[in-house]
Interface confidence: low
């Protein structure tokens, strides 16, 4: 089926917000910080609860300019640690393997496909 305008805009809006605000510790002004904190908490919760990473997948953090990339060295954090597979203590199962992109140690699925199903039913 043809992509609708809604199909096009919704993930892009999510992506823009995530890239702009996630872990952005140098906002345009102090008043904007609470928005960034809220977005960061929401994304952390989403990625941990739904075992997903970014909007379309871990490559979001590699492909696009982001506040996260500004704040974090690519070698140390190719993607947020919330993208890693966690143990029951909510700690990465193997942080190094996650950072290296070893299958099974990081979440390869984007969060949008997991949450768009429930959203599109309404």
């Amino acid at each position: 089926t043809a992509a609708t305008q809604q199909d096009f805009f919704t993930p892009n809006l999510f992506l823009k917000q995530m890239l702009e605000r996630y872990q952005n510790n140098s906002p345009p002004n102090n008043d904007d910080q609470w928005k960034n904190n809220g977005v960061t908490k929401t994304w952390d919760r989403l990625m941990l609860q739904d075992n997903c990473c970014g909007v379309n997948g871990p490559s979001d953090w590699q492909k696009y300019t982001s506040a996260f990339r500004t704040e974090n060295n690519d070698a140390d954090y190719p993607w947020p640690r919330q993208c890693c597979v966690m143990n029951n203590l909510k700690e990465p199962l193997n942080l190094e393997a996650c950072k290296l992109g070893v299958p099974g140690f990081y979440h390869n699925q984007g969060c949008y496909e997991l949450i768009s199903g429930p959203m599109n039913r309404h």
């Epitope: 140098s26 345009p28 002004n29 102090n30 008043d31 928005k35 982001s66 506040a67």
Partner: antibody
Framework: EVQLQQSGAELVRPGASVKLSCTAS????????IHWVKKRPEEGLEWIGW????????KYAPKFQDKATITADTSSNTAYLQLSSLTSEDTAIYYC???????????????WGQGTSVTVSS | DIVMTQSPSSLTVTAGEKVTMSCKSS????????????LTWYQQKLGQPPKLLIY???TRESGVPDRFTGSGSGTDFTLTISSVQAEDLAVYYC?????????FGSGTKLEIK
């Protein structure tokens, strides 16, 4: 070309309310904060507040908390400033200005409207 | 609220002269996250809206002549015009762009002899 077009001059009675508009062209107000600034004759600039048109969130200077209400209509790319319980102290030129935002990059108030003159007189 | 104090309130100079004006904030405008000072300078000519000159205390907005220079850090800031031109006749405002409310200074009125 980026422009902010403000509504025309207003002459209003004390105690009344007035609603000023600021229509953007050349950019989407969802990608900016829209600020409002007051300039009284022979006095300096006073910052009133801002709106994030993406979600309608507003922030006001404490002095204007009970005086001003900022709203936005993204479908018409327009921001509004409503001033209530007008007195002679509200006689001033009111400017709208934009602060662009994207990927956490900082922008100052780079584009301003031409200003709307409000005169409060019986 | 952060109080912005500008001095002098007005000054009269001859074209070609160097001019400096001061802006002091009651609290530091340095953002420790990126080591930038959130201090902005605007120029307002009679009958016109303010025009952005300098942001981050020292970064010139594109299109602004290089005779305008901003300097300073923390609470003390300066705007310098290296060689004043007739078209620089205006009021110059500094603004705290660090925290709500984003207060302006009272302005420095520049007049040309």
């Amino acid at each position: 070309e980026v422009q902010l077009q403000q509504s025309g001059a207003e002459l209003v009675r004390p105690g009344a309310s007035v609603k000023l508009s600021c229509t953007a062209s050349g950019f989407n107000i969802k990608d900016s904060f829209i600020h409002w600034v007051k300039k009284r004759p022979e006095e300096g600039l006073e910052w009133i507040g801002w709106i994030d048109p993406e979600d309608g969130e507003t922030k006001y200077a404490p002095k204007f908390q009970d005086k001003a209400t900022i709203t936005a209509d993204t479908s018409s790319n327009t921001a509004y400033l409503q001033l209530s319980s007008l007195t002679s102290e509200d006689t001033a030129i009111y400017y709208c200005a934009r602060r662009e935002r994207f990927y956490g990059i900082y922008y100052a108030l780079d584009y301003w409207g031409q200003g709307t003159s409000v005169t409060v007189s019986s | 609220d952060i109080v912005m104090t500008q001095s002098p309130s007005s000054l009269t100079v001859t074209a070609g002269e160097k001019v400096t004006m001061s802006c002091k904030s009651s609290q530091s405008l340095l953002n420790s996250g990126n080591q930038k000072n959130y201090l902005t300078w605007y120029q307002q000519k009679l009958g016109q809206p303010p025009k952005l000159l300098i942001y981050w205390a020292s970064t010139r907005e594109s299109g602004v002549p290089d005779r305008f220079t901003g300097s300073g850090s923390g609470t003390d800031f300066t705007l310098t015009i290296s060689s004043v031109q007739a078209e620089d006749l205006a009021v110059y405002y500094c603004q705290n762009d660090y925290s709500n409310p984003f207060t302006f200074g009272s302005g420095t009125k520049l007049e040309i002899k």
